[in-house]
């Protein structure tokens, strides 16, 4: 029961996280005009990964897309790439995890397959979350660097010094959405990986049996480990039990303690 809850919660948390990563990637407010210690301007500037916007006090908002690839800073391209990779991995992870959910029955899918799918989706969520966190952090670092470089410049105009206001940018809402979303996706991924351990079918505990063959005596222990070192020619009855494998004479599946729906 706990495994199903952990898996379900991991899925929901990851789903919220990936929705947040998508939202953050699409948001225009990655960087917003710093209003602290600034002359009061009637124009508010903010920028996203795909376009920059200006909101005027009149209520009019104008957004312009970055209609160039080569002209954009490499860091911005890197952030875009990280966010997109995060979304793609997260989306694939969600797709995989849906089929891996314990509460969903698909044909005669075995627990081992569900466990593997849960682990795969968990890893995908972790990488997706890390991509988002990395992308947002790279952008934040870029902002901090630019902030201190963007001090007010002085231009010499006709009749003396004329000050121009250099727009400085600070952290926008999208950064916080991205950090939280990335964190949630990461947590969801970890939960899926934890759930995977509980989903993996337990090894059947076979009692140690001594086979008294005409040749060397070989004792067999569970887990496929041969206790004896005697290698004789008579090996027809030497059966090694593997935790996940099933032999012909074990076609019926044994319920594990986690097989409650």
């Amino acid at each position: 029961m706990a495994v199903t809850a952990c898996q379900g919660l991991g899925f929901v948390v990851s789903l919220i996280g990936i929705a947040g990563i998508i939202a953050a990637t699409c948001m225009d407010q990655w960087s917003t005009q710093d209003l602290y210690n600034n002359p009061v301007t009637a124009v508010f500037n903010y920028q996203g990964l795909w376009r920059s916007c200006v909101r005027e006090s009149s209520g009019f908002t104008e957004c312009r897309g970055y209609f160039t690839l080569l002209g954009l800073p490499a860091m911005l391209q890197a952030v875009r790439a990280l966010m997109i990779v995060g979304i793609v991995l997260g989306a694939i992870g969600l797709l995989v995890s849906i089929f891996a959910l314990k509460c969903i029955r698909i044909g005669s899918m075995e627990d081992s397959a569900k466990a593997n799918m849960t682990l795969t989706s968990g890893i995908m969520f972790i990488v997706s979350g890390l991509c988002a966190i990395a992308g947002v952090s790279v952008f934040a670092n870029m902002l901090v660097t630019n902030f201190w470089m963007s001090t007010a410049n002085m231009y010499t105009g006709m009749g003396g010094m004329v000050q121009t206001v250099q727009t400085r940018y600070t952290f926008g809402a999208a950064l916080f959405v991205g950090w939280v979303a990335g964190g949630l996706t990461l947590i969801g991924g970890v939960m899926m990986c934890i759930a995977c351990r509980g989903l993996a079918p337990e090894e059947t505990n076979y009692k140690a049996v001594s086979y008294h063959a005409s040749g060397h005596s070989v004792a067999y222990k569970p887990g496929g480990f041969k206790a004896s070192t005697g290698f004789g020619s008579n090996t027809k009855n030497k059966k090694i039990y593997d935790g996940g494998a099933r032999t012909e004479d074990e076609v019926q599946s044994y319920p594990s303690k986690h097989d409650y729906v």
Epitope: E56, S57, S58, E62, T164, Q166, T167
Partner: antibody, heavy 118, light 113 residues
């Protein structure tokens, strides 16, 4: 069609108060920035207060700050200018104007005259 | 507050001739976010409210004749009437729309010579 009609002007004694109203129609009132602009007889234009679109922040020049208050009633589609501690130099035609692109003022009312005199 | 200075205070131009009015601001009105200059030009005739001519320093308002044009960037701006018509006699004002409070120039009175 955008329409702005000012009212509330008149004669008032120095130190007195007056409340100007501007009835707006033909647009979504809360979405646009609005301004009160005055013009003293034979003089130039002076912006006395601005309320921004959406967030409704208010701004005043030093000449009226602390004495004038701009506000709006979205339900009534009305803009107001509360003028206290009036002085002789506040005598002017007061225009209500709606802003748009570039914070410019494409729409103006016909104005209302405020006379401050003893 | 931002100081807007217009020159000349008055201008007399012959019909069909070019009229040029200048406006200078004490601070740059250029917004780096969209590379637009927040300067507006108005025309006011006696007994009427002002009429918007140009916004963003060079964008003509719809319905304004194309003989009116605006130019300039940063702190120096110009309104040009390419061929003066009788109906263009008025007072012209520039306005800072970038910094609060929005301030107007003192006005330039345009007359026919």
């Amino acid at each position: 069609e955008v329409q702005l009609v000012e009212s509330g002007g008149g004669l008032v004694k120095p130190g007195g108060s007056l409340r100007l109203s501007c009835a707006a129609s033909g647009f979504t009132f809360s979405s646009y920035g609005m301004s009160w602009v005055r013009q003293a007889p034979g003089k130039g234009l002076e912006s006395v207060s601005t309320i921004s679109g959406g967030d409704s922040y208010t701004y005043y020049p030093d000449s009226v700050r602390g004495r004038f208050t701009i506000s709006r009633d979205i339900a009534k589609n009305s803009l107001y200018l509360q003028m206290n501690s009036l002085r002789a130099e506040d005598t002017a035609v007061y225009y209500c104007a709606r802003s748009y692109n570039g914070n410019s003022l494409p729409y103006w009312g016909q104005g209302t005259l405020v006379t401050v005199s003893s | 507050d931002i100081v807007m200075t217009q020159s000349p205070d008055s201008l007399a131009v012959s019909l069909g001739e070019r009229a040029t009015i200048n406006c200078k601001s004490s601070q740059s009105l250029l917004n780096s976010g969209n590379q637009r200059n927040y300067l507006t030009w108005y025309q006011q005739k006696p007994g009427q409210p002002p009429k918007l001519l140009i916004y963003w320093a060079s964008t003509r308002e719809s319905g304004v004749p194309d003989r009116f044009s605006g130019s300039g960037s940063g702190t120096d701006f110009t309104l040009t009437i390419s061929s003066l018509q009788a109906e263009d006699v008025a007072v012209y004002y520039c306005q800072n729309n970038y910094f609060y409070p929005f301030t107007f120039g003192q006005g330039t009175k345009l007359e026919i010579k």
